[in-house]
Structures are given as structure tokens and as C-alpha cells.
């Protein structure tokens, strides 16, 4: 019955406005930090679910969460919270995180399906490609971890956890 959330108009989403009014819209109502899957709704004055606004045309407040949500729906991909990007498992099989285990293990059983560079790796060829030197190592963070996107940058576990900051 409800068309809300399905037939939206264009223009800035209402929830984007907190970027310009981070303190909220009511006098005396302080903006709180919200769980990663929620955003601060300045009109209601409470943390609200990002899931229900992911289909809004121009929401940015929940951008990282919404990207991860849509990424998880794609087979053979996972959302890298550190890089804030949707990563194809096919491109990192062999040095893959656990999110890609199912995909990569199936692929490795049938080498005909592997991309050429991985077929060469399996047959003993070593590709000396500078693009692979920073190959993604997975998000098995324990304490301090080097960021694959920013070589040399050390991130604490707490910093890694701050993946949905807006």
C-alpha cells in the first residue's frame, strides 16, 4: 500500500541536511553518535535505520552502509570497509579474506574459470606487476594493521572500526 520509500522525488535527501546542521534542528537536542547501520535523523531527533533510505536518490549520510548493503547482494563480491569499496573476489583469489573463501575455493577447483593472472600463478608463473605489490590482505585486524590502500599507515583496531563515519 505505501508508496513511501518507493516513489521518491529527486533532490537532496532530508537526511543529508545533518551535514549542514550537525547539531540537530531542535534547540537543546544534541546529536548523538549512532550505530554503524543507522544515521542521526535531525527532524526526529533520534538514530534511524539506514536500510530504509538506501533507495533514496541522493542520500549521502548512509552512503558507506548502503554501498556495503548493495555489494553484499552481488555474488562474488564483498565490501571492504577500509577501502570503502566493493571488491571482486575474482581479483584477489589466492590472497583473499574469509568473505571470499567460498567463491575462491570453488574457483580454484576449476582453473578454467580463473582469470589469466591467477591461472599463471597456479601453474608456477610469477607476475612481477607493481599493481599486485599492495595486494589486499584481508580484514583480519588484530591490534595494529597496515592499510593496503595507504602503505605505511598504521591503523588501530578502533580506527578500523570507524568505517561508517559520515
Amino acid at each position: 500500500m505505501s508508496g513511501l520509500g518507493r516513489s521518491r522525488r529527486g533532490g537532496r535527501s532530508r537526511v543529508d541536511q545533518e551535514e549542514r546542521f550537525p547539531q540537530g534542528l531542535w534547540t537543546g537536542v544534541a546529536m548523538r553518535s549512532c550505530p554503524e547501520e543507522q544515521y542521526w535523523d535531525p527532524l526526529l531527533g533520534t538514530c534511524m535505520s539506514c536500510k530504509t533510505i538506501c533507495n533514496h536518490q541522493s542520500q549521502r549520510t548512509c552512503a558507506a552502509f548502503c554501498r556495503s548493503l548493495s555489494c553484499r547482494k552481488e555474488q562474488g563480491k564483498f565490501y571492504d570497509h577500509l577501502l570503502r569499496d566493493c571488491i571482486s573476489c575474482a581479483s584477489i583469489c589466492g590472497q583473499h579474506p574469509k568473505q571470499c573463501a567460498y567463491f575462491c575455493e570453488n574457483k580454484l577447483r576449476s582453473p578454467v574459470n580463473l582469470p589469466p593472472e591467477l591461472r599463471r600463478q597456479r601453474s608456477g608463473e610469477v607476475e612481477n606487476n607493481s599493481d599486485n605489490s599492495g595486494r589486499y590482505q584481508g580484514l583480519e585486524h588484530r591490534g595494529s594493521e597496515a592499510s593496503p590502500a595507504l602503505p605505511g599507515l598504521k591503523l588501530s583496531a578502533d580506527q578500523v572500526a570507524l568505517v561508517y563515519s559520515t
Epitope: M1, G5, R14, V15, G45, C47, S49, T52, I53
Partner: antibody, heavy 120, light 111 residues
């Protein structure tokens, strides 16, 4: 299909309290706030407040602070409203309604209402 | 609190005619280009039903004869053509500021 099923009519004595329920189905209960609205016989609609089931945040209109208490139970997807120190002024139909958020803010689904009659 | 004043309080129209119900807010309900004004229909013995949200967006499943317009503080609900099924109370409601508030209602009757 989204549905809000409210508890049955109540006949209560002045000074007593009453607790009514609103069971939600057909959507993720914690993703939307639940509003409560009062309607006296033959009169208009009066917003009482809302509860956010994900964190139990509540907001009330000034008039209902101390009169209404909103709670929710995530495990049963049920919102509750308790009205205390009842008088004849509290005789009304009380509706729960789901509130949308994000681009637009509206009450898109309503319960059928719970009738409360305060009489000695 | 934002006060919403609806007019007229009641009106009687002939089937097939047009009808316009007005709602005036005590202050603007605009928020970054969107009017946070809704319209609801309530038939006797039933719960209210959302007709229009954001001043002019027709809710899914609502007949196209219902339309909403306005911005800032002045809004209107238009029904054209009026059908027998439209006999009801109509309420405007703002969600720009908590507490959300409703207009006093307009009773639509058929001549």
C-alpha cells in the same frame, strides 16, 4: 503486507491505568518509529508521541508527558502505550501508526485503534 | 508548536464537482525545498489513511483524483471529481517539527 494490530477495547475506572498494545508485522519493526495518536469521539487527531524501537528513544508532546508511557518489545515486534491516572478526558480511541523517515515523514500505516472508556 | 488551521470545517458538494480543502500553518513547514505536510482521509469508524505526503506526492493506491499543492505555510487538498466514496473527514498534518500536529479536520458531505 504491513499490518498493525491493536489490542481490544478497555473500560477502566477513573484514577486507574491502562496498557494497550500494537503488534507490527510485515516489516522490520526496529527500522521505523511507532507513533501514537489520540482521537476523542467526534473530534480531531492529537499526536501523543513516538517510540524508536531500535533504541527505545521516546518523544512526547508536552501535554502527554507524565500521562503516557511508550515502550516496545523487539522480540515480539510490539509497541505499548500505558496511560496513567485516567480521567474522563482520556476517553478516546488511540491509534498506533508507523512513521516513515528520510525524504518524507508521514504516518503510512495505522492500527485499527483501541477504544478506551473511563467511567466509574 | 506549529498550529494548523483547516478550512472549511465542513462542506457539501455534488458528485462530480471539484472540492478544495485548505490548511494554513502558523510557521513554514519547508525543509530544504520539501514541504513536510501530509493529508489523511478518515471514514467513520475507521483509522485515518495517508493520501498525500510531502505536500504533493500521492500515496501508492490512492486514486488520481486526489492531489495536493502548496508550500511554506499554505497548502491545499483537491478532489476532482468527487465520488460518493470520498465522504469522510480530511486532516492535514505537519512533520517539520516535533510535536507533529494535525489540523482540526474538514468534513466532506455530498449534497
Amino acid at each position: 503486507e504491513v499490518q498493525l494490530q491493536q489490542s481490544g477495547p478497555e473500560l477502566v475506572k477513573p484514577g486507574a491505568s491502562v496498557r494497550m498494545s500494537c503488534k507490527a508485522s510485515g516489516y522490520t519493526f526496529t527500522n521505523y518509529v511507532m507513533h501514537w495518536v489520540k482521537q476523542k469521539p467526534g473530534q480531531g487527531l492529537e499526536w501523543i508521541g513516538y517510540i524508536n524501537p531500535s533504541n527505545d528513544d521516546t518523544k512526547y508532546t508536552e501535554k502527554f508527558k507524565g500521562k503516557a508511557t511508550l515502550t516496545s518489545d523487539k522480540s515480539s515486534s510490539t509497541a505499548y502505550m500505558e496511560l496513567s491516572s485516567l480521567t474522563s478526558e482520556d476517553s478516546a480511541v488511540y491509534y498506533c501508526a508507523r512513521g516513515t523517515h528520510g525524504d518524507y515523514y508521514a504516518l503510512d500505516y495505522w492500527g485499527q485503534g483501541t477504544s478506551v472508556t473511563v467511567s466509574s | 508548536d506549529i498550529v494548523l488551521t483547516q478550512s472549511p470545517a465542513s462542506l457539501a458538494v455534488s458528485l462530480g464537482q471539484s472540492v478544495t480543502i485548505s490548511c494554513r500553518a502558523s510557521e513554514s513547514v519547508e525543509y530544504y525545498g520539501t514541504s513536510l505536510m501530509q493529508w489523511y482521509q478518515q471514514k467513520p469508524g475507521q483509522a485515518p489513511k495517508l493520501l498525500i505526503y510531502g505536500a504533493s506526492n500521492v500515496e501508492s493506491g490512492v486514486p488520481a483524483r486526489f492531489s495536493g499543492s502548496g508550500s511554506g505555510t499554505d497548502f491545499s487538498l483537491n478532489i476532482h471529481p468527487v465520488e460518493e466514496d470520498d465522504i469522510a473527514m480530511y486532516f492535514c498534518q505537519q512533520s517539520r517539527k516535533v510535536p507533529w500536529t494535525f489540523g482540526g479536520g474538514t468534513k466532506l458531505e455530498i449534497k
